[in-house]
């Protein structure tokens, strides 16, 4: 039986300041049960970029509709990119836990670089 894989197809994405960046992520299975979150950076100091369940992320939209059934596409778009957004973004699958969810598998990461705004 194939274990779930987290696929981030682009190793890097370059976006002009002020534009939107699309970070792609797909899962190969609906199970194990548990949420998907996006982070910038790795390790203890990583920054949460998107979690559908909790938090307010006004610049982030999901590429697939939130009401799509049995969705395997967890790509996001970040609007109004600035140089401060540069970094490596990870799509992470968690296994449902009680009380806390446990990190199950991470994508390989996508490095976002920000170009100067065209004049």
């Amino acid at each position: 039986e194939d274990e779930l894989q987290v696929i981030q197809p682009e190793k890097s994405v370059s976006v002009a300041a002020g534009e939107s960046a699309t970070l792609r992520c797909a899962m190969t299975s609906l199970i194990p049960v548990g949420p998907i979150m996006w982070f910038r950076g790795a390790g203890a100091g990583r920054e949460l970029i998107y979690n559908q369940k909790e938090g307010h992320f006004p610049r982030v939209t999901t590429v697939s509709e939130l009401t799509k059934r049995n969705n395997l596409d967890f790509s996001i778009s970040i609007s109004n990119i600035t140089p401060a957004d540069a970094g490596t973004y990870y799509c992470v699958k968690f296994r449902k836990g009680s009380p806390d969810d446990v990190e199950f598998k991470s994508g390989a990461g996508t490095e976002l670089s920000v170009r100067a705004k065209p004049s």
Partner: antibody, heavy 120, light 108 residues
């Protein structure tokens, strides 16, 4: 067409064991979480247990007594019920989980159920 | 554990009339709520998910609304096959998945 067929119900005495099975067809069984829900006579619905791949979840009322498992090669879901009590008497339904995008699970297909009666 | 309270417990309606009943959650479940219909002697059937989306094959007379803690299921122009028990279920925070106690829609 998705089909879920439960079997294994029956009459047992308190403290005894029973193993329920649910044969699934019409979908890629190994890709979906599966759930057992029960309904005591004349009562509402009560979630019992859910299994993903290796991940299992139980209601407090059955934890330590019931074990959910699956055999993807046979497209079959199981519920091993030990130390049965009178309050476990119910129709047990097998259900296929479905998700909405980034959210949790609900149940889009149900079997017809199998009756478990625990009585001395 | 999130508690779902359905009201009324029983609703007496004449065929062709409109039926509206509610499901209240003890805490915010966003839109992570489903509705099921259970006819006598049958298994539950999914009607609505994500609070307002009709399952494939469910007639348009069924509609769901609400978000957060207050949800409503409405059946316009009740048909004979609609007389049944209706359950709500939350899937926002689990385990456990929780169901409401049900609303029985009976013929007036």
């Amino acid at each position: 067409d998705v089909q879920l067929v439960e079997s294994g119900g029956g009459v047992v005495r308190p403290g005894e064991s029973l193993r329920l099975s649910c044969a699934a067809s019409g979908f890629r069984f190994s890709n979906f979480a599966m759930t057992w829900v029960r309904q005591a006579p004349g009562e509402g619905l009560e979630w019992v247990s859910t299994i993903g791949s290796g991940d299992t979840y139980y209601a407090d009322s059955v934890k330590g007594r019931f074990t959910i498992s699956r055999d993807n090669s046979k497209n079959t879901l199981y519920l091993q019920m030990n130390s049965l009590r009178a309050e476990d008497t119910a129709v047990y339904y097998c259900a296929k989980d479905s998700t909405v995008s980034w959210s949790g699970d609900f149940f889009d297909y149900w079997g017809l159920g199998t009756l478990v009666t625990v009585s001395s | 554990e999130i508690v779902l309270t359905q009201s009324p417990a029983t609703l007496s309606v004449s065929p062709g009339e409109r039926a509206t009943f509610s499901c209240r959650a003890s805490q915010n479940v966003k839109n992570d709520l489903a509705w099921y219909q259970q006819r006598p002697g049958q298994a539950p059937r999914l009607l609505i998910y994500a609070a307002r989306i009709r399952e494939t094959g469910i007639p348009e007379r069924f509609s769901g609304s609400g978000s957060g803690t207050e949800f409503t299921l409405t059946i316009t122009s009740l048909q004979s096959e609609d007389f049944a028990v209706y359950y709500c279920q939350q899937y926002y925070d689990w385990p456990p998945f929780t169901f409401g106690g049900g609303t029985k829609v009976e013929i007036k």
